[in-house]
């Protein structure tokens, strides 16, 4: 069963600042991926970027950097500030769709052991809930 | 080979309620997304709703937030669609489809909202 | 949402003729556009999905071109088996949004 993995953390030195990495762990090739926060795009969640293999990459505020780090994973850096900034327990989800097969998402937040005062988690866990 | 098939269509009033079910078979139904579609007659298509593989994420269009609700038993390979306040608009034909974008559908099942 | 127009809505064409459809969205879907082909009382079957792929068992007289906010779908021949509805979808974002459809009748 393809699974998407979303991993969150906030950058200890920029406390406004969010790394989001998504991956995915099925065979097929990525034809899109959507990043949203606030819930799954469509379902009550705002799109923050969308990556296309060979047309290139989308995003919008507070979204700062979309990339992708391999085939089948990407990041997302935010960086907000004020009404767009995110928080500790904003929920970020990931949408890999691999046409004409299907489409697999995953949604995450902030670890709650997460302490923004601190040093952020190298390496926090894939969520377990993927879809 | 990839086999949908729609039941539970047929006639209710306006404000009634339905539930439709899509048995699935020839593919391993808990790794795939899947679709309601709609079309009332005589005319185009309309997506109605989607359900993410495990069940956890769906997705609805304004025309029929609040009202239909998508659910699958991946146990039993199939999907659902419960319709409540039901309108003479939502008279139709309803396929269950898979796939992103859809790939495979069903036959379809003919609701009709009448009083 | 993303609208998705459609023309033209329908056309008479004969057995052998080339045929274009097109479609334009209201903002920009990059390549994730869908086509399907559906005849009376029937369920709709894919065609074309990411704007130029043909699916499983579509023959190759099907093809698609375009991409952000302009489509097209081509038959290059068309046969007896062709004349039907066919419909553009964007699967770039939810809600699924369809084109109205375009109708290929027999002149």
């Known amino acids: 069963t393809p699974e998407v993995w979303v991993q969150v953390r906030m950058e200890a030195t920029e406390l406004s600042s969010f790394t989001i990495r998504c991956g995915f762990l099925g065979s097929g090739s990525i034809s899109l991926v959507t990043v949203s926060w606030g819930g799954p795009n469509g379902a009550g969640g705002t799109t923050l970027a969308v990556l296309h293999p060979e047309r290139g990459i989308r995003q919008w505020a507070p979204a700062r950097q979309a990339r992708w780090e391999t085939q089948s994973s990407i990041s997302l850096i935010l960086e907000g500030s004020g009404a767009s900034s995110p928080c500790a327990n904003t929920t970020f989800c990931c949408k890999f769709a691999s046409f004409p097969e299907g489409s697999w998402e995953a949604c995450g937040s902030l670890p709650p052991s997460s302490d923004p005062g601190l040093s952020a988690p190298p390496t926090p866990a894939p969520i377990l809930r993927a879809d | 080979e990839v086999q949908l098939v729609e039941s539970g269509g047929g006639l209710v009033k306006p404000g009634g309620s339905l539930r439709l079910s899509c048995a699935a078979s020839?593919?391993?139904?808990?790794?795939?997304?899947l679709s309601w579609v709609r079309q009332a007659p005589g005319k185009g298509l309309e997506w109605v709703s989607e359900?993410?593989?495990?069940?956890?994420?769906?997705y609805y269009p304004d025309t029929v937030t609040g009202r239909f609700t998508i659910s699958r038993d991946n146990a039993k390979n199939t999907l659902y669609l419960q319709m409540s306040s039901l309108r003479a608009e939502d008279t139709a034909v309803y396929y269950c489809?898979?796939?992103?974008?859809?790939?495979?559908w069903g036959q379809g099942t003919l609701v009709t909202v009448s009083s | 949402d993303i609208q998705m127009t459609q023309s033209p809505s329908s056309l008479s064409a004969s057995v052998g003729d080339r045929v274009t459809i097109t479609c334009k969205a209201s903002?920009?879907?990059?390549?994730?556009v869908a086509w399907y082909q559906q005849k009376p009382g029937k369920a709709p079957k894919l065609l074309i999905y990411?704007?130029?792929y043909r699916f499983t068992g579509v023959p190759s007289r099907f093809s698609g071109s375009g991409s952000g906010t302009d489509f097209t779908l081509t038959i290059s021949s068309l046969q007896p088996e062709d004349f039907a509805t066919y419909y553009c979808?964007?699967?770039?974002?939810?809600?699924?949004?369809f084109g109205g459809g375009t109708k290929v009748e027999i002149k």
């Open positions: 990411s704007t130029s």
């Open positions: 489809a898979r796939g992103d974008p859809f790939g495979y």
């Open positions: 020839g593919f391993t139904f808990s790794s795939y997304g």
């Open positions: 359900i993410s593989s495990g069940g956890t994420y769906t």
């Open positions: 979808q964007q699967h770039y974002s939810t809600p699924r949004t």
């Open positions: 903002q920009d879907v990059m390549t994730a």
